[in-house]
Interface confidence: medium
C-alpha cells in the first residue's frame, strides 16, 4: 500500500551491519506525488565507486544514486547528510555489504516523505500541449480560447471542421494563420458550389508553410484536396509545392489539414472561386450561334440558327432554329440537333416530259426537266434547270417552284406535203403531213387540233351534234383503221355567238362566224401523227394577200366518190372575195343571190379545179408562218362554197383569235391549272 512517509534503517542499526548482506526496500507513495528521500546518518565502508559496501537508490532501471563512506551535515540546523528528490511515486533502496569489514560501520538511517510534484515544470516533456495547472497530488491541462481539450485530457486542438463554403468565391486559411497552426488537429473544410461550377483553388507559394516531410518523404503535417474520385496532395513544406491553380472539374471539394504534435509553422491560406463549367464551342459551317462568344459556360443559352438551306429534322417536321443550354455537366442540351441540308425530295414528274434523277435531293442539288421532243417544248422558254432551294422546294432560275409545262409544238408536220394541188381530183396525203387533222364521223367532216384539249372546226359541223366523236392520227378512216386510231370524246362544244342557228340548216345562206371550239374530255398525246396547228398571230404579218398559198386536207367528196376513205390534200392560193361571189351557187334549197359574203371569210382556190368539198368542212386552211417557215398556222377553216371544184370560202381565223383564246382560258381543264 502506498504510504505518505516512512523510515529505512540498515540492518542492526545503530549497531554495526553484518557482512555479506543484501537487502532492498520498495518505497511507494500515492499517484501524483514525488518522493523526498533523505539520510540523517551514513556510515558505510568507503571504497572506490562504493564497490565493497553501498546503499543504492533506484528509480526503475535508473540509478538515482549510490552512497558509501561517512557523511555529516553541513547545515547546523538540519540533520540531513544526503537527500534525493524524485518526481516519481516509486523508489527502490538496496543495501549491500561484502564479506569483510576492517572496521565497525554502523550503516545508515533514512526517511522518505511524499512530496507534491509540479508536473507542469518538473519534466522535460510538458504534460500539456498548452496550459498546465498544478495542484497537490496532480495537475490538469487547459486550452486557450477557441481550442478544445482532446479526450486524452492533455492535448488541445482547434474545432476547425464542419465549415461548408457555398459562395462562388472565398478564402480559407489554417487556424491562427499566419501564427503557428495547432498541433494534433484534423481540419476539414467543404466547398459545395451549385452544379455547373467547378471549384478552382489558388495557393500562392508564399502563403504556405507546413511542417516539412520526414527523411522518407512522408508529410508529418499535410494539406489534401479531394474532389470526387480525384485527390490533390498531400502537400507540405515551405512554399506551396502543388500547381498554383488547381482546377477540380467538380462543384464539390473537401480540404483536409492534418497536424501532428509538434511544430511552429505558420500554416496556409488559399483562395477559391467557382468557374462556370465550360461547354465546347462547336464551329459548324451549317449554323450560326447567337450570341457569338469566345467561350461558352454553364447556363449560357445560345440560339442556333441553321444557315439558309439547312434545317433540324425531328419526326416529320423541320425547324430552322433552336435553343441550346450549357448544362451543369459541361455538355450542351439538344446536342443531338444538327443543322442538316434541307431535303427537297424526289422532284415531281410532269406531263409530256421527264425529269433527270438528281444525284442528290439535298439543298443545292440540281435537276433538269425536259419535254418530249420534238412534239412538246417548254412553255415560257425555260431551260428546265431546277435546284433544291432552302425552303425545301425545287425551283427554277426565276426561283419559282412552279413546275415547267410541256406544251405541244404546233404547226410542224413530221413530213412536209408534196402532193398534187387538189382534193377534188385527189392527191393522197399522209396524216404525218397534216398531224392536226381531226376526223368527225357525224357529220362527216374535219377539224383542226389546236391544243391538247381543244379542236377548232366550223360551226355548221357541230351545230347539229353537240357531242361529236372525233379521231386523230390516222390517214385512213376505214372502220378497221379508225379502231386503231385515237378517238377523242368531247366535253363541251362552244359555237361562236355570232353564228345564227336556223331551223332548216340546209337553207343557210349566211355562213358568217362559221367557227366553233370543241373541248375534249381528256388531253391528246402528241406524236408523229398527232400535233396541233398554230393559231395566227395578231400582227399584220398574218394578214393574207391574194395568191398566198395554203394547204387543205380532208376525207370529203372527191370527183370519184362522195367520201374519201384516205386523206386527200391540196395546195390552194388565196383569191379575191369577188371571185367567190361570181360563182353560181348550186343549192336548190336557197336563193343564190341571198348568200352573204363578209370580211370574216377567205376566198381560195379556182385554179385547175382544186377545192375543198362536202365532207371537208371544219378542216384547216394551213398557211406557212411568215415568221417561222417551218411552221403552219390555221388561217382558215373549210366553211362553204358555191360549187365544188371552183372557189371555196374559209372562215378567217385571224378575226377570231381573241374569242378562241378567251374561250379556252375561261374553260381550262382544272387538272391542268
Amino acid at each position: 500500500e502506498p504510504t505518505m512517509y516512512g523510515e529505512i534503517l540498515s540492518p542492526n542499526y545503530p549497531q554495526a551491519y553484518p557482512s555479506e548482506v543484501e537487502k532492498s526496500w520498495d518505497i511507494e507513495v500515492p499517484e501524483g506525488y514525488g518522493i523526498h528521500l533523505y539520510f540523517t546518518h551514513l556510515d558505510i565502508e568507503l571504497s572506490e565507486n562504493c564497490a565493497y559496501d553501498s546503499v543504492q537508490i533506484m528509480s526503475g532501471d535508473i540509478e538515482e544514486g549510490r552512497l558509501c563512506g561517512q557523511r555529516t551535515s553541513n547545515n547546523p540546523h538540519s540533520p540531513i547528510v544526503e537527500e534525493f528528490q524524485v518526481p516519481y511515486n516509486k523508489l527502490q533502496v538496496i543495501f549491500k555489504s561484502d564479506f569483510s569489514n576492517e572496521e565497525r560501520f554502523t550503516g545508515f538511517a533514512a526517511y522518505y516523505v511524499a512530496t507534491d510534484i509540479n508536473e507542469c515544470t518538473d519534466f522535460v516533456d510538458a504534460p500539456c500541449s498548452h496550459f498546465c495547472n498544478n495542484f497537490i497530488g496532480g495537475y490538469f491541462c487547459s486550452c486557450p480560447p477557441e481550442y478544445f481539450l482532446h479526450d486524452d485530457m492533455k492535448n488541445c486542438g482547434v474545432n476547425c471542421s464542419g465549415d461548408v463554403f457555398t459562395a462562388l468565391i472565398g478564402e480559407i486559411a489554417s487556424p491562427n494563420y499566419p501564427k503557428p497552426y495547432p498541433e494534433n488537429s484534423r481540419c476539414e473544410y467543404q466547398i459545395r458550389l451549385e452544379k455547373g461550377f467547378q471549384v478552382v483553388v489558388t495557393v500562392r507559394r508564399e502563403d504556405f508553410d507546413v511542417e516539412p516531410a520526414d527523411s522518407e518523404g512522408n508529410c508529418l503535417d499535410s494539406l489534401v484536396f479531394v474532389a470526387g474520385d480525384q485527390q490533390f496532395g498531400p502537400y507540405c513544406g515551405r512554399g506551396f509545392p502543388g500547381p498554383l491553380n488547381i482546377e477540380t472539374k467538380s462543384n464539390a471539394l473537401d480540404i483536409i489539414f492534418q497536424t501532428d504534435l509538434t511544430g511552429q509553422n505558420k500554416g496556409w491560406k488559399l483562395r477559391y472561386h467557382g468557374d462556370p463549367m465550360p461547354c465546347p464551342k462547336e464551329e459548324t459551317p451549317t449554323s450560326v450561334w447567337e450570341p457569338a462568344k469566345a467561350k461558352y459556360v454553364f447556363r449560357d443559352v445560345v440560339r442556333i440558327t441553321c444557315l439558309d438551306g439547312f434545317e433540324v429534322v425531328e419526326g416529320r417536321v423541320g425547324a430552322t432554329s433552336f435553343h441550346s443550354t450549357c448544362q451543369s455537366n459541361g455538355k450542351w442540351s439538344n446536342s443531338k440537333l444538327k443543322c442538316q441540308p434541307v431535303d427537297c425530295g424526289i422532284p415531281e414528274s410532269i406531263e409530256n416530259g421527264k425529269v433527270e434523277d438528281p444525284e442528290s435531293t439535298l439543298f443545292g442539288s440540281v435537276t433538269r426537266y425536259t419535254c418530249e421532243e420534238p412534239y412538246y417544248y417548254m412553255e415560257n422558254g425555260g431551260n428546265g434547270q431546277y435546284h433544291c432551294a432552302s425552303n425545301g422546294s425545287w425551283v427554277n432560275e426565276a426561283l419559282s417552284p412552279e413546275l415547267p409545262k410541256c406544251v405541244p409544238v404546233c404547226g410542224v408536220p413530221r413530213e412536209p406535203f408534196e402532193g398534187k394541188q387538189r382534193i377534188i381530183g385527189g392527191s393522197d396525203a399522209d396524216i404525218k403531213n397534216f398531224p392536226w387533222q381531226v376526223f368527225f364521223d357525224n357529220p362527216w367532216a374535219g377539224g383542226a387540233l389546236i391544243d391538247e384539249y381543244w379542236v377548232l372546226t366550223a360551226a355548221h359541223v357541230v351545230e347539229g351534234n353537240q357531242e361529236p366523236t372525233m379521231y386523230v392520227g390516222s390517214t385512213s378512216v376505214q372502220t378497221s383503221r379508225l379502231a386503231k386510231s385515237k378517238m377523242l370524246t368531247s366535253e363541251r362544244v362552244f359555237i361562236h355567238p355570232g353564228w345564227k342557228l336556223l331551223e332548216v340548216p340546209e337553207a343557210r345562206t349566211n355562213f358568217d362566224n362559221d367557227i366553233a371550239l370543241v373541248q375534249l374530255k381528256d388531253p391528246v398525246k402528241m406524236g408523229p401523227t398527232v400535233a396541233p396547228i398554230c393559231l395566227p398571230g395578231t400582227s399584220s404579218d398574218y394578214n393574207l394577200m391574194d395568191g398566198d398559198l395554203g394547204l387543205i386536207a380532208g376525207w370529203g367528196r372527191t370527183e370519184k366518190r362522195d367520201r374519201a376513205l384516205r386523206l386527200k390534200a391540196a395546195r390552194l392560193p388565196v383569191a379575191p372575195l369577188r371571185k367567190c361571189r361570181e360563182v353560181k351557187v348550186e343549192n336548190p334549197k336557197a336563193d343564190a343571190g341571198a348568200y352573204v359574203f363578209t370580211p370574216n371569210m377567205i376566198c381560195a382556190g379556182g385554179e385547175k379545179g382544186m377545192d375543198s368539198c362536202k365532207g371537208d368542212s371544219g378542216g384547216a386552211f394551213a398557211v406557212q408562218d411568215p415568221n417561222d417557215k417551218a411552221k403552219f398556222y390555221v388561217a382558215g377553216l373549210v366553211s362553204w362554197g358555191p360549187q365544188c371544184g371552183t372557189y371555196g370560202l374559209y372562215t378567217r381565223v385571224q378575226n377570231y383569235v381573241d374569242w378562241i383564246k378567251k374561250t379556252m382560258q375561261e374553260n381550262s381543264t382544272p387538272s391542268k391549272d
Epitope: 425531328e314 425547324a319 433552336f322 435553343h323 443550354t325 448544362q327 442540351s333 446536342s335 443531338k336 440537333l337
Partner: antibody, heavy 116, light 107 residues
Framework: EVQLQQSGAELVRPGALVKLSCKAS????????MHWVKQRPEQGLEWIGW????????IYDPKFQGKASITADTSSNTAYLQLSSLTSEDTAVYYC?????????WGQGTLVTVSA | DIVMTQSHKFMSTSVGDRVSFTCKAS??????VDWYQQKPGQSPKLLIY???YRYTGVPDRFTGTGSGTDFTFTISSVQAEDLAVYFC?????????FGGGTKLEIK
C-alpha cells in the same frame, strides 16, 4: 415506321429492383436521346432522365438520382430503365420517349406495381 | 428546377366552344415549350412544339402562343374527341419538367 415497344407489366415486392425495356424500330437510337417518364395513377408526368445511346451519357432529374439507372444497347436498338429499392411510391406507368427537339414518339407504357 | 404551373386542374366546355389553357414557367424558357394531349389509357401525343408550331397531322383547331414565362394553348372549336388531359413541358434546360396537366371535360 417509327415504333417504341415497351416490355410488359411488372408486379414486384418492396425493396426489389426491376428493369424495363424499350425496343425501338424504324430508326437508330444512336441518333436520338431516349427519355423515361413516370406517371403515377391519376397524376401528372415526371421526367426521370435521358440517355444518349451514342456515348452512354445520362442526365437525371436529381430526385431520381440513385433510384433510376438508364442504359442502352445499341446493338439491339433498345433502351432500359432500372429502378431499385422499390417502394409503393414507385407504383406507376413508365413511358419511354424519343427526342431531338421534342418528344415526338412515345412507347405504350409499362405498369409497375409494387406490392407485398 | 424550372416549375411549370397549369393553374386549372379541370376545364369544362361544350362541343364547338373555344377553350384556352395556360401554363406559367418559373423562369424565362424562351419558346422551348411543348404541349401534349393524353387521352384515357393512352400515351401522351405531341400537339404543339416550340410554343407555337403545330406538329404534323395535328388539326388546325389546336394552336399555341407565348414566350418567356407565359404560354397559352387554345382549341378553337372543341370536338367530342378532344376529351383528354393536356400537359405543357419545358425543354429549355434539364431537368425537363411538365405542368400538372389540365383535364378537359365536355359538358
Amino acid at each position: 415506321e417509327v415504333q417504341l415497344q415497351q416490355s410488359g407489366a411488372e408486379l414486384v415486392r418492396p425493396g426489389a429492383l426491376v428493369k424495363l425495356s424499350c425496343k425501338a424500330s424504324g430508326f437508330n437510337i444512336k441518333e436520338y436521346y431516349m427519355h423515361w417518364v413516370k406517371q403515377r395513377p391519376e397524376q401528372g408526368l415526371e421526367w426521370i432522365g435521358w440517355i444518349d445511346p451514342e456515348n452512354g451519357d445520362t442526365i437525371y432529374d436529381p430526385k431520381f438520382q440513385g433510384k433510376a439507372s438508364i442504359t442502352a444497347d445499341t446493338s439491339s436498338n433498345t433502351a432500359y430503365l432500372q429502378l431499385s429499392s422499390l417502394t409503393s411510391e414507385d407504383t406507376a406507368v413508365y413511358y419511354c420517349a424519343r427526342s431531338r427537339l421534342f418528344f415526338a414518339y412515345w412507347g405504350q407504357g409499362t405498369l409497375v406495381t409494387v406490392s407485398a | 428546377d424550372i416549375v411549370m404551373t397549369q393553374s386549372h386542374k379541370f376545364m369544362s366546355t361544350s362541343v364547338g366552344d373555344r377553350v384556352s389553357f395556360t401554363c406559367k414557367a418559373s423562369q424565362d424558357v424562351r419558346t422551348a415549350v411543348d404541349w401534349y394531349q393524353q387521352k384515357p389509357g393512352q400515351s401522351p401525343k405531341l400537339l404543339i412544339y416550340s410554343a407555337s408550331y403545330r406538329y404534323t397531322g395535328v388539326p388546325d383547331r389546336f394552336t399555341g402562343t407565348g414566350s418567356g414565362t407565359d404560354f397559352t394553348f387554345t382549341i378553337s372549336s372543341v370536338q367530342a374527341e378532344d376529351l383528354a388531359v393536356y400537359f405543357c413541358q419545358q425543354q429549355y434546360t434539364t431537368p425537363y419538367t411538365f405542368g400538372g396537366g389540365t383535364k378537359l371535360e365536355i359538358k
